[in-house]
């Protein structure tokens, strides 16, 4: 049978030939009649055999990490017979390990993110090194991890490569750290090989900073002509945090006047001061408001960093704008009696310059030939007024600043012309009446009514009478109905068309004004030839008379 021990050959041997061992047949008596042969991968190139003795030699430097064992076949032949002495047999040559490989970090680059202010012991990342040497061969591949750079903020567990936080870090002071980890084999004993890796550790932000105003005092200006909603300026706070943690909200802390507001521009993180109520330079021209700023998102556990909001004071100066004159009233109503002489006093309007400089005011009336106004605002008449032509005048009065003629205000002035009794009553229409020749006494000839162009103070009352002459002639008489109408009646029986074809009756109409006015109005009465049935035979006005319902008998 075959005789051999286990074969080992150390890797990395520099000698040209290294004795590995010997294989032989127990039938070999040493007389050199046997020939040993080596077959398989590596035979003849890596390993050779002494054909006579069976001694095996390694003729190449071996690398266990490249190949840790060789499986070869051995033959032994009797030279004399040429026959195999032993059956062909397989044997193994193991390459024994030496510590020729340093630890290597295969998962580089390492990068980790950890929240700032994380407590001690927080796990950051685990790094792992590999050693190509034989883990089963002593300590060649037994690794120990240590920190070369990163103290005092980080530590590494020696056997696991777990990196932990060993001191709280503030992202706002430093937002990333390079940690260098060393792995040593031979558990750090002398002769150990080492490898290093760098770990980039980035700190993620937590909201541990409140926003703080850049300035403790701001100065803004606003024109008094600015409409509500106008942006009058911006204020700015800074937050050392980033992203959502730096989003902030501005608000008013103090503004007794409630004139201003602050809105937040969430894109620029600026506070925009806006006008909430219109300002008036003459009323108040200096304002002071206090603004505060807070983070938009604050976690409950981080409230300790946000106890007192940062504030700033904003001085706001109102800029004067030259304003037009201001009338005491939005409109004026004056009264004046008609027929008063020209130059009569109507009323006084008053406007003032609302600005501090108090410019004198000039007044004018737009397009009026009837009224005049002086620099004191006194309105007078330029003509006598007739209420019956115009009872009201709508004037437009303009006030202009003497020092700035572009500053103009206008208001309406209404002038009511009051009535005086300057018109007598008169017939409400033209009357023509008709009487039959054969009319009897007391016949109603005409009902008349009157109008008065004057305005009635309470109610017009008219009084109707015949003139003295007509009263004396007594052909007709008048009855006042006491309702501003009167009736004309015949005062005799029979009329003669040939002798007196027409009567002209003078009727006096008086009003109840003080003093009373009276007018004389003429009523024309035509005499008509009527038949017995009352139908007219000769009367040019008969159609009209009949249509008006007059009936003659």
């Amino acid at each position: 049978g075959w005789v051999w021990n286990q074969f080992f050959v150390p890797e990395e041997m520099n000698t040209t030939s290294h004795h590995v061992g010997r294989l032989r047949s127990d039938l070999d008596n040493g007389n050199n009649s046997f020939q040993y042969k080596l077959l398989g991968a590596g035979a003849g190139s890596t390993f050779i055999i002494d054909e006579r003795t069976g001694d095996i030699y390694a003729i190449e430097k071996l690398d266990r990490e490249e190949r840790s064992l060789y499986i070869l076949r051995a033959q032994v032949i009797d030279i004399t017979t040429g026959r195999a002495v032993e059956p062909e047999s397989e044997f193994v040559i193991k390459v024994s390990d030496i510590n020729d490989n340093e630890p290597k970090f295969l998962d580089e680059p390492y990068e980790a993110i950890v929240p700032e202010m994380s407590p001690e012991g927080t796990l950051v990342i685990q790094v792992t090194a590999s050693d190509a040497d034989d883990p089963s061969s002593g300590n060649n591949a037994r690794l120990l991890y240590s920190l070369l750079q990163g103290q005092p903020y980080f530590s590494v567990e020696p056997t696991t490569g777990v990196i932990r936080i060993s001191s709280k870090m503030d992202r706002e002071l430093q937002d990333e750290y390079w940690v260098i980890i060393q792995a040593k084999d031979m558990i750090g004993q002398p002769g150990a090989l080492s490898g290093t890796t760098s770990v980039l550790i980035k700190l993620s932000d937590v909201n541990d900073n409140k926003p703080i105003f850049k300035e403790s005092l701001y100065r803004l200006t606003v024109s008094e002509s600015a409409p509500t909603g106008t942006s009058i300026g911006t204020i700015m706070a800074y937050d050392n945090d980033i992203g959502e943690n730096a989003e902030m909200d501005y608000s008013i802390e103090e503004d007794d006047s409630q004139t201003f507001d602050i809105i937040t521009n969430h894109e620029t993180q600026e506070g925009i001061v806006i006008l909430k109520k219109k300002v008036n330079f003459e009323h108040q021209n200096h304002y002071g408001i206090r603004a505060k700023v807070k983070n938009h998102h604050v976690d409950e556990q981080l409230m300790k960093y946000h106890t007192e909001a940062s504030t700033t004071f904003i001085k706001i100066q109102v800029e004067d704008v030259d304003e037009p004159p201001l009338f005491l009233l939005p409109y004026y109503i004056f009264e004046i009696f008609e027929e008063t002489p020209q130059g009569s006093f109507v009323g006084v309007v008053s406007a003032t310059d609302p600005d501090n400089r108090k410019s004198p005011i000039r007044y004018s009336i737009t397009r009026s030939k009837v009224f005049n106004i002086d620099d004191n605002g006194t309105i007078t008449t330029t003509n006598s007024l007739d209420r019956e032509i115009s009872a009201w005048y709508n004037l437009s009065i303009t006030a202009t600043e003497k020092y700035n003629i572009e500053q103009i205000s206008s208001i309406p002035v209404y002038v009511q012309v009051l009535n005086i009794n300057d018109h007598a009553p008169e017939f409400s229409q033209y009357y023509e009446s008709y009487v039959c020749e054969n009319a009897g006494s007391g016949q109603v000839i005409q009902t008349i009514s009157a109008v008065d162009r004057d305005e009635s103070i309470e109610e017009h009352h008219f009084y109707f009478n015949l003139s003295v002459e007509d009263t004396n002639s007594s052909s007709f008489t008048i009855i006042d109905n006491q309702d501003n109408t009167a009736v004309i009646l015949t005062n005799r029986t029979g009329f003669n068309l040939q002798e007196e074809p027409i009567f002209y009756i003078s009727i006096l109409i008086a009003d109840n004004g003080i003093p009373s006015l009276t007018s004389t109005n003429t009523l024309t009465i035509h005499v008509c030839d009527c038949d017995d049935s009352g139908s007219t035979q000769t009367c040019q006005y008969q159609e009209l008379m009949l249509s008006m319902g007059f009936k003659t008998e």
């Epitope: 005092l217 100065r219 108040q284 021209n285 200096h286 004071f313 001085k315």
Partner: antibody, heavy 120, light 107 residues
Framework: QVQLQESGPGLVKPSQTLSLTCTVS??????????WSWIRQHPGKGLEWIGY???????YYNPSLKSRVTISVDTSKNQFSLKLSSVTAADTAVYYC????????????WGQGTLVTVSS | EIVLTQSPGTLSLSPGERATLSCRAS???????LAWYQQKPGQAPRLLIY???SRATGIPDRFSGSGSGTDFTLTISRLEPEDFTVYYC????????FGPGTKVDIK
């Protein structure tokens, strides 16, 4: 701490122009948000505000004195100045320069004042 | 302009007593726009109170301010010998005007 110091002639003839300068120390006249004022006090009387200036040169005056007053600023010298024209005896007063406050328009810092007499 | 009236013109009190000085405005002013000053002879005025109840830096707490609308008060809780001097109120909302002053003298 901010300190203010007035300087200028103590005697001015009627109809002439009164000129005073206020020098600021312990702080910059260009500090954001602060206004620099002139105030006067007639002998034995109350205080009268004359006007103020901002470091940008923007000024605002008491309407009753506006036509005669000019206030200017020189940021390089940390000074601001008052000119009051056409003076009369009624302008005889102690003239103070002052700076307003950090929380309002009140006068927080004052100079010690300088007496200006208008007399021929 | 807003006119400030101070009363009384003179207040005669003894050290240790309480002083109440009044300042009245001709029209409403926001309480945030009133200040009080103390002026000693030959000196510049010194800010005491602003807004109208905030004490200026270094002002003892015996000085206090109050009021709103048109009526404002400066109170000195216990008069010290150095408090006997002149006090002015000032409004700073509509331009700047001072009151005529109240003199606190020793009775």
């Amino acid at each position: 701490q901010v300190q203010l110091q007035e300087s200028g002639p103590g005697l001015v003839k009627p109809s002439q122009t009164l000129s005073l300068t206020c020098t600021v120390s312990g702080g910059s006249i260009s500090s954001s948000g602060y206004y620099w004022s002139w105030i006067r006090q007639h002998p034995g009387k109350g205080l009268e505000w004359i006007g103020y200036i901002y470091y940008t040169g923007s000024a605002y005056y008491n309407p009753s004195l506006k036509s005669r007053v000019t206030i200017s600023v020189d940021t390089s010298k940390n000074q601001f100045s008052l000119k009051l024209s056409s003076v009369t005896a009624a302008d005889t007063a102690v003239y103070y320069c002052a700076r307003d406050g950090s929380s309002g328009w009140y006068f927080q810092y004052w100079g010690q004042g300088t007496l200006v007499t208008v007399s021929s | 302009e807003i006119v400030l009236t101070q009363s009384p013109g003179t207040l005669s009190l003894s050290p240790g007593e309480r002083a109440t000085l009044s300042c009245r405005a001709s029209r409403n002013i926001s309480s945030s726009y009133l200040a009080w000053y103390q002026q000693k002879p030959g000196q510049a005025p010194r800010l005491l109170i602003y807004g109208p109840s905030s004490r200026a830096t270094g002002i003892p707490d015996r000085f206090s301010g109050s009021g709103s609308g048109t009526d404002f008060t400066l109170t000195i809780s216990r008069l010290e010998p150095e408090d006997f001097t002149v006090y002015y109120c000032q409004q700073y909302g509509s331009s700047f005007t001072f009151g005529p002053g109240t003199k606190v003298d020793i009775k």
